[in-house]
Amino acid sequence: PGPPAGSPRVSSDPRADLDSAVLLTRSLLADTRQLAAQMRDKFPADGDHSLDSLPTLAMSAGTLGSLQLPGVLTRLRVDLMSYLRHVQWLRRAGGPSLKTLEPELGALQARLERLLRRLQLLMSRLALPQAAPDQPVIPLGPPASAWGSIRAAHAILGGLHLTLDWAVRGLLLLKTRL
């Protein structure tokens, strides 16, 4: 008899699963790039924007050599869950100015949720633990002003774009090591 119902199935071809995660990540990267460009057109950014509640960057040229699939997938999932929370917060608390981007933000959220489900599936197929975030969840209060929500949107989209960019490179690299 096979494994009991509900137990994680170890995939026969993890490369194919990883391929599909790469495709979704690339697709979300392109969407985020497009939305970030729209943001810049509608609300030009004056310099750089950051939010303390956003995750710190997990990958760089220096970390590529030591990447391990479990660590990358776990960290990516935790970071993307944080970005999902920030996108949801933007949609809820962003104010009238960001309402013009509501369809795009909604689509971005749906794509992000889809990628998270794909990563979760990949982790269960590889029998990896579904780790909970190790950092405390910072409650997101309402933006101080309309301009504050625009600055936050720039920071969230910029950070998400950068995270996805590195994620594609990391996942591609890990695929070659499987």
Epitope: R26, L29, A45, G47, D48, H49, S50, L57, S60, A61, G62, T63, G158, G159, H161, L162, D165, W166, V168, R169, L172, L173, T176
Partner: antibody, heavy 117, light 110 residues
Framework: EVQLLESGGGLVQPGGSLRLSCAAS????????MNWLRQAPGKGLEWVGV????????FYADFVKGRFTISRDNSKNTLYLQMNSLRAEDTAVYYC??????????WGQGTLVTVSS | QSVLTQPPSASGTPGQRVTISCSGS????????VNWYQQLPGTAPKLLIY???LLPSGVPDRFSGSKSGTSASLAISGLRSEDEADYYC???????????FGGGTKLTVL
């Protein structure tokens, strides 16, 4: 708007040293790996090296190992390239470029380094 | 000599479709993303295609990239006079632990 502005190029004698700077603005500099690339007159592009966003890791092309050093000061939003033991074949326009993953998404306008006696 | 191989020149007439090839090995193109850069005369290079076929903001969709095995190609449809430039392919090389470029292709619009 993302801007990268190189400076410090000029004429230097073989065996001499030069320090290039790249001033960054319009983005969170401390979040990005940064690179130096070069292009000899009439030739193609050549990657010199990369430094990670926090400065903890550096990788160099074989032709500059031991002679060139990349560093950064995140508090000043500035990238540096210290070039020692310069040779005639190091004559080129040097560019700094930002890396958000596998590619160079923004480049500076370049600064010319001429190594000649 | 460049690690990645590109034709030194290519040409086409306005409105035509032109393709530029780039070939490498398993340690670069085979295992890593390919990026393309455009360098207009007298200017700094500009990112044209990343992760094999993605377009950065502001790049017209007349430009497209593709990859198969250890080769990649850049296609430009509806050629315009302003496309006259040098085009470079690039990829990370696992053996060299660095970025490698093609020698560049000079595109002339006739």
């Amino acid at each position: 708007e993302v801007q990268l502005l190189e400076s410090g190029g000029g004429l230097v004698q073989p065996g001499g040293s030069l320090r290039l700077s790249c001033a960054a603005s319009g983005f969170t500099f401390s979040h990005y790996d940064m690179n130096w690339l070069r292009q000899a007159p009439g030739k193609g592009l050549e990657w010199v090296g990369v430094i990670s966003y926090d400065g903890s890791n550096k990788f160099y092309a074989d032709f500059v190992k031991g002679r060139f050093t990349i560093s950064r000061d995140n508090s000043k939003n500035t990238l540096y390239l210290q070039m020692n033991s310069l040779r005639a074949e190091d004559t080129a326009v040097y560019y700094c470029a930002r890396t958000p993953g596998s590619h160079f998404d923004y480049w500076g306008q370049g600064t010319l380094v001429t190594v000649s006696s | 000599q460049s690690v990645l191989t590109q034709p030194p020149s290519a040409s086409g007439t306005p409105g035509q479709r032109v393709t530029i090839s780039c070939s490498g090995s398993s340690s670069n193109i085979g295992n890593n993303a390919v990026n393309w850069y455009q360098q207009l005369p007298g200017t700094a290079p500009k990112l044209l295609i990343y992760y094999d076929d993605l377009l950065p903001s502001g790049v017209p969709d007349r430009f497209s990239g593709s990859k198969s095995g250890t080769s990649a190609s850049l296609a430009i449809s509806g050629l315009r006079s302003e496309d006259e430039a040098d085009y470079y392919c690039a990829a990370w090389d696992d053996s060299l632990n660095g970025v490698v470029f093609g020698g560049g292709t000079k595109l002339t619009v006739l």
